[in-house]
């Protein structure tokens, strides 16, 4: 089948990084500078993405793959392939459509993106508050109030581990 197809369509023999040049009797020509073809048999090469302004180059364009962009410091990616850069806020803030604003009492944000999250309600799991929450940190729940009766052994809170962090989008 492959051989039959290539007899019918000489372009199918052109590998990635080349294009089938109709102006040169369907010869496979290399992609010109600043362009690429990621699959074989293409009749044109695609223009490389340029990472300008708030975008910065994460991976250079090659003849067989497009450039990849991420965001300059102070911004983060949104959308497939980092189609947009959005400004970071500080921890303890959320980005509204009017800019960064502090988390309201009872909420926190330990990230530089996203919105403020309500503090954990320790009592719902039968626990007590060991460390109060702040704008930047959730409350830390301790043992249940019954465990804190006189004579009960004190509980040493665990060393803080890394809080949930960013996922590459």
């Amino acid at each position: 089948f492959e051989r039959t197809r290539s007899l019918q369509d000489p372009c199918s023999n052109c590998p990635a990084g080349t294009f089938c040049d109709n102006n040169r009797n369907q010869i496979c020509s290399p992609c010109p500078p600043n362009s690429f073809s990621s699959a074989g048999g293409q009749r044109t090469c695609d223009i490389c993405r340029q990472c300008k302004g708030v975008f910065r180059t994460r991976k250079e364009c090659s003849s067989t793959s497009n450039a990849e962009c991420d965001c300059t410091p102070g911004f983060h990616c949104l959308g497939a392939g980092c189609s947009m850069c959005e400004q970071d806020c500080k921890q303890g803030q959320e980005l509204t459509k009017k800019g960064c604003k502090d988390c309201c009492f009872g909420t926190f944000n330990d990230q530089k993106r996203g919105i403020c999250r309500p503090w954990t309600n320790c009592s719902l799991d039968g626990k007590s508050v060991l460390v109060n929450g702040t704008k930047e940190r959730d409350v830390v729940c301790g043992p249940s109030p019954a465990d804190l009766s006189p004579g009960a052994s004190s509980v040493t809170p665990p060393a803080p581990a890394r809080e949930p962090g960013h996922s590459p989008q």
Partner: antibody, heavy 120, light 108 residues
């Protein structure tokens, strides 16, 4: 690749409890909040609660407070959702879903779902 | 915290479907959309109003302003037939996660 694999279907009697598990792989389990969402037959999606696997901190929808408990075992990268005092209208498919690293974005990976049937 | 969706939207193949999600000042929130097919887990198709995760086709887009968010599917195909849900996160401790009632997209 990220995968969330849930425990199998359960049949329970009214008043009983059910505990559904969700085993995560392909990423750092402690680094991402896990949510639970359910869908009853012929109904829409309903958010139940979340857990921070790192701290164990939770939050539950008011409707389920007092009946739902979400826990985790970081040593085996597994989250659990236990629902008590089951009623017939708790018959639903229960899903775990991962938050993508910050609050306010969409849930990017979902388990395959666990059917819980409550019937006498 | 109520998100209102039409129960169903019907569209012919190749046409454009628009599914709305209404809520008080929803334009100030970040809206996410999920596709749900029978016996399958939901799939995130648009997040934070208008961004597509990797693997979601460009013909799916979202917008959000005022009291209405909209999911738009252009050049609709038979495989797009599914239920679609909007969703918003709030900073309230009692109702952090809210879904709309869902819209069945029917391909004529």
């Amino acid at each position: 690749q990220v995968q969330l694999v849930q425990s199998g279907a359960e049949v329970k009697k009214p008043g009983a409890s059910v505990k559904v598990s969700c085993k995560a792989s392909g990423y750092n389990f402690s680094g991402y909040y896990m949510h639970w969402v359910r869908q009853a037959p012929g109904q829409g999606l309903e958010w139940m609660g979340w857990i921070n696997p790192n701290s164990g901190g939770t939050n539950y929808a008011q409707k389920f407070q007092g009946r739902v408990t979400i826990t985790r075992d970081t040593s085996i990268s597994t989250a659990y959702m236990e629902l008590s005092r089951l009623r017939s209208d708790d018959t639903a498919v229960y899903y775990c879903a991962r938050e993508p690293g910050y609050y306010g974005s969409g849930l990017d990976y979902w388990g395959q779902g666990t059917l819980v049937t409550v019937s006498s | 915290y109520v998100l209102t969706q039409p129960p169903s939207v019907s569209v012919a193949p190749g046409e454009t479907a628009r599914i709305t999600c209404g809520g008080d000042d929803i334009g100030d929130k970040r809206v996410h959309w999920y596709q749900k097919k029978p016996d399958q887990a939901p799939v995130l198709v648009v997040y934070e109003d208008r961004y597509r995760p990797s693997g979601i086709p460009e013909r799916i887009s979202g917008s959000n302003s005022g009291n209405t968010a909209t999911l738009t599917l252009s050049r609709v195909e038979a495989g797009d037939e599914a239920d679609y849900y909007c969703q918003v996160w709030y900073s309230s401790p009692d109702h952090p996660g809210v879904f709309g009632g869902g819209t069945q997209l029917i391909i004529l």
